[in-house]
């Protein structure tokens, strides 16, 4: 795995990796602002549970299909996948904020982006999302909810915004009239939608429509919930690649220097090179690091 910008240069020298030649394709209540000195319960350190630990600026929304197309046992597997993913994210109001929504003919938010709870508590809440087993799970309704409720106001413009749409069913056509409009609305707000189709009844037509709306909207199509665990690392890695590192704290003018910071080009501050499970956690916010890169096949 590549650990810095400098490594991309090295990779470029070894082999020319391109997919395109030049000339080719041309809602919780609002909170008071967080002061840097305020300590919240979620800031109390909980050690990383895995080698892969995504320390990025990211607002991530999990959208869980609550239809009867998933049995109750399969829904438990889906929740376990969400909890597993949450274990690999540096969840806090400063780094990765998460929301968890179960959708049926409406939407039920269990966790909001601004909820100030310890990561372990948020994982507990996610594990207790109730199985709805409804006849309908409306992707249009949940995307509308994501657009107008969760991302109605962009309060962290520096963070990437991603909706992970876990879908196992097809909504009736009458409900999907405004589907594309909502996906386009999310794109306008720079929200990336990542559909994860699960099982034989997932709406492939909608998945392809989502992919068509924005090049960042990468879909994952799985034959059953049993494949979620296999795909988890790839999904979380893709999400993390889309999110920026924290910018270094700004220095007062008299302290500002024009020298290159140690974490920029030097390898010494980047921590260990990462193997299959990349370690995205930096212990010091001032160490600037660009994400690992898997060499293109």
């Amino acid at each position: 795995e590549r650990g810095s910008l400098n490594d991309i240069f090295e990779a470029q020298k070894i082999e020319w990796h391109t997919s395109q030649e030049p000339g080719g394709l041309v809602v919780p209540p609002t909170d008071a602002p967080v002061s840097p000195t305020t300590l919240y319960v979620e800031d109390i350190s909980e050690p990383p549970l895995h080698d892969f630990y995504c320390s990025r600026l990211l607002d991530l929304v999990f959208l869980l299909d609550g239809s009867s197309r998933l049995s109750e046992a399969e829904f438990e597997v889906l929740k376990a996948f969400v909890v597993d993913m949450m274990e690999r994210l540096r969840i806090s109001q400063k780094w990765v904020r998460v929301a968890v929504v179960e959708y049926h003919d409406g939407s039920h938010a269990y966790i909001g982006l601004k909820d100030r709870k310890r990561p372990s508590e948020l994982r507990r809440i996610a594990s207790q999302v109730k199985y709805a087993g409804s006849q309908v799970a409306s992707t249009s309704e949940v995307l509308k909810y994501t657009l107008f409720q969760i991302f109605s106001k962009i309060d962290r413009p520096e963070a990437s915004r991603i909706a992970l749409l876990l879908m196992a069913s097809q909504e009736p056509q009458r409900m999907s009239r405004n589907f594309v409009r909502y996906v386009q609305g999310l794109k306008k707000k720079k929200v990336i939608v990542i559909p994860v189709g699960i099982g034989p009844h997932a709406n492939l037509k909608q998945i392809r429509l989502i992919e068509k709306q924005a090049p960042e909207n990468k879909a994952f199509v799985l034959s059953s919930v049993d494949e979620l665990e296999q795909q988890r690392d790839e999904i979380v890695s893709y999400l993390c690649d889309l999110a920026p590192e924290a910018p270094p704290p700004t220095l007062p003018p008299d302290m500002a220097q024009v020298t290159v910071g140690p974490g920029l080009l030097g390898v010494s501050t980047l921590g260990p090179k990462r193997n299959h499970h990349h370690h995205h956690h930096h212990h010091h916010a001032h160490i600037v690091m660009v994400d690992a890169y898997k060499p293109t096949k």
Epitope: L5, I8, S160, I192, P215, D241, A243, P244, Y293, K294
Partner: nanobody
């Protein structure tokens, strides 16, 4: 429709400066690492400068370090390359490119930079 459009190239004397711009559309710009490449006839494209998503990290090819500066404006979906103390060997077609995850996904058409001695 994804587009990357470079501008700012031209003819300049050795020791002079140029500022290249690359305006993008059709992508969520802030989730792409951006790079500037250059290519001269018969040679492989060379990665010249690279900038991270937020713009807080940059890196450069040894041949341009201290002379070139890459920057980005995420509000305007644009990346820049400030080229100072230009040398005849900097003559090339300069391309901007957008990197998502592990691959360079999108490319501009290129802009010619010619440095005369």
């Amino acid at each position: 429709q994804v587009q990357l459009v470079e501008s700012g190239g031209g003819l300049v004397q050795a020791g002079g400066s140029l500022r290249l711009s690359c305006a993008t559309s059709g992508i969520i710009f802030s989730v792409y690492h951006m790079g500037w490449f250059r290519q001269t006839p018969g040679k492989e494209r060379e990665l010249v400068a690279l900038i991270s998503l937020s713009g807080s990290s940059t890196d450069y090819a040894d041949s341009v370090k201290g002379r070139f500066a890459i920057s980005r404006d995420n509000a305007k979906d644009t990346v820049f390359l400030q080229m100072n103390t230009l040398k005849p060997e900097d003559t090339a077609v300069y391309y901007c490119a957008a990197r998502l995850g592990s691959s360079w996904k999108y490319w501009g058409q290129g802009t010619q930079v010619t440095v005369s001695s």
